[in-house]
């Protein structure tokens, strides 16, 4: 398990002509928020799935009103990270969709209106536990700058968050920089060390000593940008101009744009113009609607009939987040007392109690009467570290909560019959005996063998 974190640095007009108008105006002040959708793998099949790795919605940004005559600036952003928890292994390769939404705060009937300003998508390699990766994506005339990383949540560790490192009863004595691991509890794990010099921004490793490059970078240490020139062989050294002897295949050859997208070459690569409902580098990603099932954990999807309209997930108890992807952290309320360890099993909370304490919330002190309530007038008796409830007549069980059968112990002597009574028991004695428990024989002359006073 772990968390994918996305930090938006700026959203504003991109470079070049055709700068967009500000999305907000004096008449219609607005604020931005962002949505991220994650899907595993790099394959187009995986890209067709809903946000299988999870999704998250940012907070709303500050309200912005356009200044008349001023160019559109970078727009004010919401505070904080977008966090997408993932429960299983981090896949290492993933697709992302980041949507920029505008919330108009005018006097709309029925509350604020939402509209999608921009949507960017990409496919990346990323090892969990690595440094922040920076990225710039353009959507039309807009430019989005952001960083992202995946980190494991304790006790998970490793590039895929599949190893567990959980100190059991107490901190480990592993050497400096090492940490104890379970289920291989009898070893100490060294932090992963990539090949010396491996670029922290563009490289990562899944095994010690290797250096694997993120998309767009190459070389043994991932420090060389991938060339985007379409030349197969350069001109000879005498040539004063750069160019190609033989034109190589162009980036749009074979049309890399899926789903009917049209390809146009750019100075560095190519760009796909996608038909409505598709987006991504190669138009391989379809818009997320309620039909895609974006609400996790049994959430109810409302609205969002077409890709450019928003949907809302109504989450069941125990879940939250824009896609019901976050389990409410019930352990944060610290329900386990006396140092107990809280475990959220989903269907229930469990407390694992420290020695000497017990009960659903570790509320009972096993060693003294203070932690034990004896019901129905019972009294707690302790001694030598042990304790028990001494129950009032007619009650039994560990806490005197059970109605005892007063006749179960056969209290009537000499064949007397026992009858349970609301206040205890009554013995009907056999002929020749008397007393509350039929313990005294009756002498033939009518006198009873009562003990002397």
């Amino acid at each position: 398990a772990g968390v994918f974190e996305l930090q938006i640095h700026s959203f504003g007009p991109g470079p070049g002509p055709g700068a967009p108008r500000s999305p907000c105006s004096a008449r219609l002040p607005c604020r931005l928020f962002f949505r991220v959708c994650l899907k595993p793998g790099l394959s187009e099949e995986a890209a067709e799935s809903p946000c299988a790795l999870g999704a998250a919605l940012s907070a709303r940004g500050p309200v912005y009103t356009e200044q008349p005559g001023a160019p559109a600036p970078d727009l004010p952003l919401p505070d904080g990270l977008l966090q997408v928890p993932f429960r299983d292994a981090w896949p290492g390769t993933f697709s992302f969709i980041i949507e920029t939404w505008r919330e108009e705060l005018g006097d709309q009937i029925g509350g604020p209106a939402w509209s999608l300003l921009a949507r960017v998508a990409g496919r990346r390699r990323l090892a969990a536990g690595g440094p922040w990766a920076r990225d710039i994506q353009r959507a039309g005339a807009w430019e989005l700058r952001f960083s992202y990383r995946a980190r494991c949540e304790p006790p998970a560790v490793g590039t895929a968050c599949t190893r567990l490192c959980r100190p059991r009863s107490a901190p480990s004595r592993c050497g400096p920089g090492l940490r104890p691991c379970a289920p291989l509890e009898d070893e100490c794990e060294a932090p992963l060390v990539c090949r010396a010099g491996c670029s922290p921004e563009h490289g990562f490793c899944e095994q010690p000593g290797e250096c694997r490059c993120l998309e767009g970078w190459t070389g043994p240490l991932c420090t060389v940008p991938v060339s985007t020139s379409s030349c197969l062989s350069p001109r000879g050294p005498s040539s004063a101009t750069t160019g190609c002897l033989v034109p190589g295949p162009g980036p749009c050859d074979g049309n890399p744009c899926a789903n009917g997208g049209s390809c146009s070459e750019t100075p560095r690569s190519f760009e796909c113009t996608c038909p409505r409902g598709f987006y991504g580098l190669r138009c391989e990603v379809s818009g997320v609607t309620c039909a895609d099932g974006p609400c996790f954990n049994g959430g109810l999807c409302v609205g969002g009939a077409d890709p450019d309209s928003a949907y809302i997930c109504h989450c069941p108890p125990g879940f939250q987040g824009s896609n019901c992807e976050k389990r409410v952290d019930r352990c944060s309320l610290q329900p386990c007392r006396n140092g107990g360890l809280c475990l959220d099993l989903g269907h229930a909370l469990r407390c694992r109690c420290r020695a000497g304490f017990a009960g659903p919330r570790c509320e009972h002190d096993l060693d003294d009467c203070a932690g034990r309530a004896c019901a129905n007038g019972g009294t707690c008796v302790e001694g030598g570290g042990a304790h028990r409830c001494s129950c009032a007549l007619g009650f039994g069980g560990r806490d005197c909560r059970e109605r005892a059968d007063p006749c179960a112990a056969r209290p009537c002597a000499h064949g007397g019959r026992c009858y349970a009574h609301f206040s205890g028991l009554v013995c009907a004695c056999a002929p020749g005996y008397m007393g509350a428990r039929c313990e005294f024989p009756v002498h033939p002359d009518g006198a009873s063998a009562l003990p002397a006073a």
Partner: antibody, heavy 119, light 107 residues
């Protein structure tokens, strides 16, 4: 790696004394309750006694058969648990295990040390 | 003292069989019960705590259930490495007491 290593076992005559030690490593010994459990040859497990952490009072509790004869103590500075056994009887013959009792269970066990009481 | 009565004292089963061991407490101990496995010549190992919770790293074929006075320990599909003696243990009250053990063998 949690390790508990018992030492001090051996052959002793009835009425004699023996002191067992348990060297602990791989966890914060001072925070942890510790116990001794024994197992007579071919028999089941029998709890001997326990000592709480100093932060929980450091008190001791014993099973009836050893009460008054055995004493459990700890030296947190040395990460060591002790079992002082006096007035030994033949029925005290057993493998003695040192155990960590952090949760309400014997979480980790040593390999055990054999104590033989025989004339 | 709380007496823990385990049954059977020994059993023989085939690989893949479902094996069930019972443990009965002489009084109500809620779910304050643990199960241990002891292989020949080795120290015991905690398998189940609080009657039904699997200890970290223990295979899921082991399970426990019960509350009050009657408890059950189950191996859903017996494996050769499960040859051992299994003990229940209560911690409701001092002295801490163990069941007499159940020796599991392969047919």
């Amino acid at each position: 790696e949690v390790q508990l290593v018992e030492s001090g076992g051996g052959l002793v005559k009835p009425g004699g004394s023996l002191r067992l030690s348990c060297a602990a490593s791989g966890f914060t010994f001072s925070n942890t309750w510790m116990s001794w459990v024994r197992q007579a040859p071919g028999k089941g497990l029998e709890w001997v006694g326990r000592i709480k952490s100093k932060s929980d009072g450091g008190t001791t509790d014993y099973a009836a058969p050893v009460k008054g004869r055995f004493t459990i103590s700890r030296d947190d500075s040395k990460n060591t648990l002790y079992l002082q056994m006096n007035s030994l009887k033949t029925e005290d013959t057993a493998v003695y295990y040192c155990t960590q009792y952090y949760w309400n269970s014997f979480d980790y066990w040593g390999q055990g040390t054999l104590v033989t009481v025989s004339s | 003292d709380i007496q823990m009565t385990q049954s059977p004292s020994s059993l023989s089963a085939s690989v893949g069989d479902r094996v069930t061991i019972t443990c009965q407490a002489s009084q109500d101990i809620s779910n304050y019960l643990n199960w241990y496995q002891q292989k020949p010549g080795k120290a015991p190992k905690l398998l189940i705590y609080d009657a039904s919770n699997l200890e970290t790293g223990v295979p899921s074929r082991f399970s426990g259930s019960g509350s009050g006075t009657d408890f059950t320990f189950t191996i859903s599909s017996l494996q050769p490495e499960d040859i051992a003696t299994y003990y229940c243990q209560q911690y409701d009250n001092l002295p801490l007491t163990f069941g007499g053990g159940t020796k599991v063998e392969i047919k």
